[in-house]
């Protein structure tokens, strides 16, 4: 098992530009200043699952 992430509570902090390192099924949510469950996307035409990239037409899909 990997090292446990240090979770620091810092409400209403303006420093929301430096994400915490999250595990593979999570991403950093600046709103709650913490790692949260993060869903993946797939493009309807190919079924390809990927991270959300700007400027692409994507449909949400539950991440595993």
């Amino acid at each position: 098992m990997g090292a446990r992430r240090l979770r620091v509570r810092s409400q209403r902090s303006r420093d929301s530009s430096v994400p915490t390192q999250c595990n593979q099924t999570e991403c950093f949510d600046p709103l709650v200043r913490n790692c949260v469950s993060c869903e993946l996307f797939h493009t309807p035409d190919t079924g390809h699952t990927s991270s959300l990239e700007p400027g692409t037409a994507l449909q949400p899909q539950e991440g595993s």
């Epitope: 979770r7 509570r9 409400q11 209403r12 902090s13 303006r14 929301s16 994400p19 999250c22 999570e26 991403c27 950093f28 949510d29 600046p30 709103l31 709650v32 200043r33 913490n34 949260v36 469950s37 993060c38 869903e39 993946l40 996307f41 991270s51 959300l52 990239e53 700007p54 400027g55 949400p60 991440g63």
Partner: antibody, heavy 125, light 107 residues
């Protein structure tokens, strides 16, 4: 199927208390943030509070701070809003909602994708 | 707290019209804006997230743009079911805040 169901609303006198519940099904609340949003009659949406059940983080609107407490019971997959010292201006339909996150280069890109049907809280003497 | 100033507060339009609603944040919020549609007596529905991404099942006539402080929701060709109230919301910094809403009415 994802579903959120609120309960616990009703008529209460000024200064009184109510506890709202938001029962979730179709997903686990543990690692998503759950929000309460209210809407006074004929008015717009006002965010009230959020909880991140996995770590117990919370935040509140200034208008309810010190009076309302948000919490979650992951074993029951339910979030709560304890409302004390209620005022007439707290009269509103209260919705709970889930914030969904999609992975945008390691950062959440999201919004409130599922909402409950709402429960009416009326504060009046 | 970040203020979200939405305009106009209401507008009248006809079926087939192109409708644009704007939202201005009081400070830079990157692209952390969502747009919601609400009909009377119903819960809001998510339309757009991260300023420009269409939520699943939302018709492609809805689109969003902007970053920083200025954001836009556009309905390219208004349909009868689109008459509703629309809200923007920022989620970059807690507390998340909503715009005051734009009511789209039938002309």
């Amino acid at each position: 199927e994802v579903q959120l169901v609120e309960s616990g609303g009703g008529l209460v006198q000024p200064g009184g208390s109510l506890r709202l519940s938001c029962a979730a099904s179709g997903f686990t609340i543990a690692s998503s943030s759950i929000h309460w949003v209210r809407q006074a009659p004929g008015k717009g949406l006002e965010w009230v509070a959020w909880v991140l059940p996995s770590v117990g983080f919370t935040d509140y609107a200034d208008s309810v701070k010190g009076r309302f407490t948000i919490s979650a019971d992951t074993s029951k997959n339910t979030a709560y809003l304890q409302m004390n010292s209620l005022r007439a201006e707290d009269t509103a339909v209260y919705y709970c909602a889930r914030r969904v996150c999609y992975n945008r280069l390691g950062v959440c890109a999201g919004g409130m994708d599922y909402w409950g049907q709402g429960t009416l809280v009326t504060v009046s003497s | 707290d970040i203020q979200m100033t939405q305009s106009p507060s209401s507008l009248s339009a006809s079926v087939g019209d192109r409708v644009t609603i704007t939202c201005r944040a009081s400070e830079d919020i990157s692209s952390a804006v969502a747009w919601y549609q609400q009909k009377p007596g119903k819960a809001p529905k998510l339309l757009i997230f991260a300023a420009s991404f269409l939520y699943s099942g939302v018709p492609s006539r809805f689109s969003g743009s902007g970053s920083g402080t200025d954001f836009t929701l556009t309905i390219s060709s208004l349909q009868p079911e689109d008459f509703a109230t629309y809200y923007c919301q920022q989620s970059q910094i807690s507390p998340p805040t909503f715009g005051q809403g734009t009511k789209v009415e039938i002309k």
